[in-house]
């Protein structure tokens, strides 16, 4: 089976490596822009140079291509906490990352958000604090684990999931609660 | 079929409260971050509220910060966003979506909206 290709794909691939094939003359293959640059005027005819610039400020193309214009630098989101890990380059978009002590939680391949990393207060560090992925928190006896966070078992309430790990507390109190009762 | 179908817009006064329900059906809502998205009167888009699939991430822009709090009942297939101390520039027609899994689009799926109007 033949993987599907584009019309884009189809026309690169008659070219060898590095080249493309003329859009208006399909017997010429022109030499692609190397990264930072972008197509300006293709090659006026076979072992001849194609016309390459240099991407404009704020502007990028991270690989060879054939492309007419540059691509827009990304901006980082600020309302999503993100910071600029290292600023856009003719050759290499901008960079966005979260502070220290915080991770990333993807709401979609193309958006994160940072979050402050759990310290785990009444408990332990299971598994550290990744960059994609909170701490993992184990928490001590008398504590359960609610969002995230070592939550004291006196706020289990007998619906909820705590009870297996509050079981002898919600007891304690039962039968505190039932000696006093006369 | 996917759907979203938003209730709970109406018109109230300025430092009122209303609370938005969407009912989804059509997919495996436990599985999906939802979002509220707003279109002011001759205005653009805006992200309101997001929330991931268990309710651990929220998302809140600025300007409903304090005020709105969005939540999720995963057994009921049911998104909500709680308005409070509402404001005349809350006023919008507001949208439930779904987060796409796609890199070409944010959210792949829209409720028709329901209309919240702020106003004395």
């Known amino acids: 089976l033949v993987p599907h290709l584009g019309d884009r794909e189809k026309r690169d691939s008659v070219c060898p490596q590095g080249k493309y094939i003329h859009p208006q003359n399909n017997s010429i293959c022109c030499t692609k822009c190397h990264k930072g640059t972008y197509l300006y005027n293709d090659c006026p005819g076979p072992g001849q140079d194609t016309d390459c610039r240099e991407c404009e400020s704020g502007s990028f193309t991270a690989s060879e291509n054939h492309l007419r214009h540059c691509l827009s630098c990304s901006k980082c989101r600020k309302e999503m906490g993100q910071v600029e890990i290292s600023s856009c380059t003719v050759d290499r978009d901008t960079v966005c990352g979260c502070r220290k002590n915080q991770y990333r939680h993807y709401w979609s391949e193309n958006l994160f958000q940072c979050f402050n990393c759990s310290l785990c207060l009444n408990g332990t560090v299971h598994l550290s604090c990744q960059e994609k992925q909170n701490t993992v928190c184990t928490c001590h006896a008398g504590f359960f684990l609610r969002e995230n966070e070592c939550v004291s078992c006196s706020n289990c309430k007998k619906s909820l999931e705590c009870t297996k790990l509050c079981l002898p507390q919600i007891e304690n109190v039962k039968g505190t609660e039932d000696s006093g009762t006369t | 079929e996917v759907q979203l179908l938003e209730s709970g817009g109406g018109l109230v006064q300025p430092g009122g409260s209303l609370r938005l329900s969407c009912a989804a059906s059509?997919?495996?809502?436990?599985?999906?971050?939802m979002a509220w998205v707003r279109q002011a009167p001759g205005k653009g888009l805006e992200w309101v509220s997001f929330?991931?699939?268990?309710?651990?991430?929220?998302y809140y822009a600025d300007s409903v910060k304090g005020r709105f709090t969005i939540s999720r009942d995963n057994s009921k297939n049911t998104l909500y966003l709680q308005m409070n101390s509402l404001r005349a520039e809350d006023t919008a027609v507001y949208y439930c979506?779904?987060?796409?899994?796609?890199?070409?689009?944010?959210?792949?799926?829209w409720g028709q909206g329901t209309l919240v109007t702020v106003s004395s």
């Open positions: 059509g997919f495996t809502f436990s599985m999906y971050s």
């Open positions: 979506a779904k987060f796409s899994t796609s890199t070409m689009a944010l959210f792949d799926y």
């Open positions: 929330i991931d699939f268990d309710g651990l991430h929220t």
